[in-house]
Amino acid sequence: MAVTACQGLGFVVSLIGIAGIIAATCMDQWSTQDLYNNPVTAVFNYQGLWRSCVRESSGFTECRGYFTLLGLPAMLQAVRALMIVGIVLGAIGLLVSIFALKCIRIGSMEDSAKANMTLTSGIMFIVSGLCAIAGVSVFANMLVTNFWMSTANMYTGMGGMVQTVQTRYTFGAALFVGWVAGGLTLIGGVMMCIACRGLAPEETNYKAVSYHASGHSVAYKPGGFKASTGFGSNTKNKKIYDGGARTEDEVQSYPSKHDYV
């Protein structure tokens, strides 16, 4: 039950995280005009990974896409790549984890297969989260560097009294969304990996010892300490040992209150 809960929670947390990564990637507010200690302007600038926008105090907002690919800074391209890789890995991870969920039955899929899929999706979520965190952190570092550079030359003299003000940019909302989303995806991935350990069949093999009494046979199975008699409706559980410990779900193959479809 705990394994199912951990796996389910890991899936949900990762789903929220990946949705957040997608949202952050699409958001325009990766960097926003720094309003502190700046001359008060009637326009507000903000930039995303794909376009830059200007909101005038009149209420009019104008956004322009970065239509060039080669003319963009390498760091921006790197951030774009990291975020896209994060989204792609996360999406594949989600797809894999749906089939790996213990509460979903697909044919006669073995628990070992589900365990492998859970581990795979977990690793994908971890890498996806790391990509998002790395992307956002690279962008944030770029902003910090540019911020201090533009603070150093905040006013660029252009001869005489004429001055031109450099627009300084600070962290936008998308950075915080990205960090939180990346963290959630990472946590979800770790939870999936933990759930995988609970799903995986134990490798330790025990010799099953049968004691034959004169009346009726009772077999003792050391793994789960479950006894089964050779009589009545339980005769289909006669095969006691089959190379490793089995989960209750596998032993009791007829529907029970513990089965979720």
């Epitope: 005009q33 001359p39 008060v40 302007t41 009637a42 326009v43 600038n45 903000y46 930039q47 830059s52 926008c53 200007v54 005038e56 105090s57 009149s58 209420g59 009019f60 104008e62 322009r64 252009m158 004429v162 001055q163 031109t164 003000v165 450099q166 627009t167």
Partner: antibody, heavy 117, light 113 residues
Framework: QVQLQQSGAELVRPGTSVKVSCKAS????????IDWVKQRPGQGLEWIGV???????NYNENFKGKATLTADKSSSTAYMQLSSLTSDDSAVYFC???????????WGQGTLVTVSA | DIVMTQSPSSLTVTAGEKVTMTCKSS????????????LTWYQQKPGQPPKLLIY???TRESGVPDRFTGSGSGTDFTLTISSVQAEDLAVYYC?????????FGSGTKLEIK
């Protein structure tokens, strides 16, 4: 069509205050900023401040304490109160609505305020 | 505050002539975010409120005759009337629409001979 209708001319005593109104029609009042501009007779234009109905105000430092901008969304009317009037406050006061580029596209007809003993 | 300097303060021309007036700001009105210059030109005829002619330094407001052209960038701006008409008799103001407080130039008075 968009219209800004200002209140009539005022003749006031020095030291008193006056409230000029600007009734907007033909557009969603809450969505646009209303600027106020002063023009002394035969002089140039001077920006007083701006109000966003329901949001906030921004004043020219030279008019802080002199002008108070308010708005009543229910009647789509902007107001400017001028206090402690002196002869320097005798001017035509315009209200105007902002447009692209923060430009002032629609103007009221102006309200002449005369401060005289 | 941004200082807007207009020149000449007045000029007298004959109908059909080309007229150029300039406006200089103490700081650049160019916004790096959208590469637009936040400078506006107004025309004020006697006894009337100002009328918007040009915004973003060069974008003509709808309904404004195409003889009015705005140009310039950064700190230096120009308003050109390609062929002056009798109805163009007015005072022309430039305005900084970028920095608060918004500031107007002292105006250029256009008179027709």
């Amino acid at each position: 069509q968009v219209q800004l209708q200002q209140s009539g001319a005022e003749l006031v005593r020095p030291g008193t205050s006056v409230k000029v109104s600007c009734k907007a029609s033909g557009y969603a009042f809450s969505n646009y900023l209303i600027d106020w501009v002063k023009q002394r007779p035969g002089q140039g234009l001077e920006w007083i401040g701006v109000i966003h109905p329901g949001s906030g105000t921004n004043y020219n430092e030279n008019f802080k304490g002199k002008a108070t901008l308010t708005a009543d969304k229910s009647s789509s009317t902007a107001y400017m109160q001028l206090s402690s009037l002196t002869s320097d406050d005798s001017a035509v006061y315009f209200c105007s609505r902002r447009w692209y580029g923060n430009s002032l596209i629609y103007w009221g007809q102006g309200t002449l305020v005369t401060v005289s003993a | 505050d941004i200082v807007m300097t207009q020149s000449p303060s007045s000029l007298t021309v004959t109908a059909g002539e080309k007229v150029t007036m300039t406006c200089k700001s103490s700081q650049s009105l160019l916004n790096s975010g959208n590469q637009r210059n936040y400078l506006t030109w107004y025309q004020q005829k006697p006894g009337q409120p100002p009328k918007l002619l040009i915004y973003w330094a060069s974008t003509r407001e709808s309904g404004v005759p195409d003889r009015f052209t705005g140009s310039g960038s950064g700190t230096d701006f120009t308003l050109t009337i390609s062929s002056v008409q009798a109805e163009d008799l007015a005072v022309y103001y430039c305005q900084n629409d970028y920095f608060y407080p918004f500031t107007f130039g002292s105006g250029t008075k256009l008179e027709i001979k």
